[in-house]
Amino acid sequence: LKGQEFAPSHQQVYAPLRADGDKPRAHLTVVRQTPTQHFKNQFPALHWEHELGLAFTKNRMNYTNKFLLIPESGDYFIYSQVTFRGMTSECSEIRQAGRPNKPDSITVVITKVTDSYPEPTQLLMGTKSVCEVGSNWFQPIYLGAMFSLQEGDKLMVNVSDISLVDYTKEDKTFFGAFLL
């Protein structure tokens, strides 16, 4: 009897389930780009393919000028994989000559930019050493987690060295988000 009494109010608490197909979502893939000048203490942001091949944006989730734009507030799963590649000879040169222009580590950061907040927020960060791997090395860094985002928030992916990003295949380097 108690269960029957609670049933109507229980139904009123929850709004009807929203179809997954209506929810904002995007999957962006790697695109070739030329390294650009950036501030010393700031990693450059990657451009992304948003419509060709496996890439898409749906349900008001838009991509513009390196940013994925969040169209409505809610909890989102955000993910990115960046595959880096290079040669170990670069590493030995760093150690011998102290060359600052080739890294001994690689870093990926997923960053949130909110217009009402002056500083970008680092949501996720991954770093790997590259000087301990074989002669022609490949290193993927995958990041993914759930975050509460507000309408108008912008997401971007920053990397420590654009010239080391593997752009040869769209399944190696990608970035996406979807409303849960």
Partner: antibody, heavy 124, light 107 residues
Framework: QVQLVQSGAEVKKPGASVKVSCKVS????????VHWVREAPGQGLEWMGV???????DYNSKFQGRVTMTRDTSTNTVYMELSSLRSEDTAVYYC??????????????????WGQGTLVTVSS | DIQMTQSPSSVSASVGDRVTITCRAS??????LAWYQKKPGKSPKLLIY???SLQDGVPSRFSGSGSGTDYTLTISSLQPEDFATYFC?????????FGQGTKLEIK
């Protein structure tokens, strides 16, 4: 891997039409843009037009009214038909998959993948 | 339409030489320039995009530079397989014009 395989050589009479096919594998014609470029003897490369991934087309104004690009999504094939042929249309015709690249915040197009080419000879 | 003018139209050089080819656009193309190598009976091969970025798998003896309307392709030390015709191409807007080509011949 990405491949574009074109139909064989053709010999046509002036005033006739030719239809060249480009069968692709390793990607879908509904996901990437396929362009057509020709190289006439002693001439450079000349862009003819594009079949956009969404199904729309854009043509070089030089060929407007004579060129038609179509596709068959079931066979992943793009076609280029050129009508009212004249001797100057004797050329090797290439299909190519376009690639997007960024410099600063602007994007541009180039052609990383090409078919093997189809020689079309127009002669009376 | 944007016009692309290459120079020289042909150049003779020897193995080991350094060769420079130039391409001029009729308007600013903001580094949206690609370079291709074309051999007789073969399809064009993309060498450089974005004026200066080396396409994957292309030997490092090839390099590109330039901005605005003026661009350069340099081959630092010619190899036997480099004798071919080279084309520039603007990627900014349709009709994505190519230069008329520079034929690189053995001296």
């Amino acid at each position: 891997q990405v491949q574009l395989v074109q139909s064989g050589a053709e010999v046509k009479k002036p005033g006739a039409s030719v239809k060249v096919s480009c069968k692709v594998s390793g990607f879908s014609v509904t996901s990437y843009n396929v362009h057509w470029v020709r190289e006439a003897p002693g001439q450079g490369l000349e862009w003819m037009g594009v079949m956009w991934y969404g199904g729309n087309t854009d043509y070089n104004s030089k060929f407007q009214g004579r060129v038609t690009m179509t596709r068959d999504t079931s066979t992943n094939t793009v076609y280029m038909e050129l009508s009212s042929l004249r001797s100057e249309d004797t050329a090797v015709y290439y299909c190519a998959r376009a690639g997007r690249y960024y410099v600063d915040s602007n994007y541009y197009w180039d052609f990383p993948y090409w078919g093997q080419g189809t020689l079309v000879t127009v002669s009376s | 339409d944007i016009q692309m003018t290459q120079s020289p139209s042909s150049v003779s050089a020897s193995v080991g030489d350094r060769v420079t080819i130039t391409c001029r656009a009729s308007e600013d193309i903001y580094s949206g320039l690609a370079w291709y190598q074309k051999k007789p009976g073969k399809s064009p091969k993309l060498l450089i995009y974005g004026a200066s970025s080396l396409q994957d798998g292309v030997p490092s003896r090839f390099s590109g530079s330039g901005s605005g309307t003026d661009y350069t392709l340099t081959i630092s030390s010619l190899q036997p397989e480099d004798f071919a015709t080279y084309f520039c191409q603007e990627g900014l807007k349709s009709p994505y014009t190519f230069g008329q080509g520079t034929k690189l011949e053995i001296k």
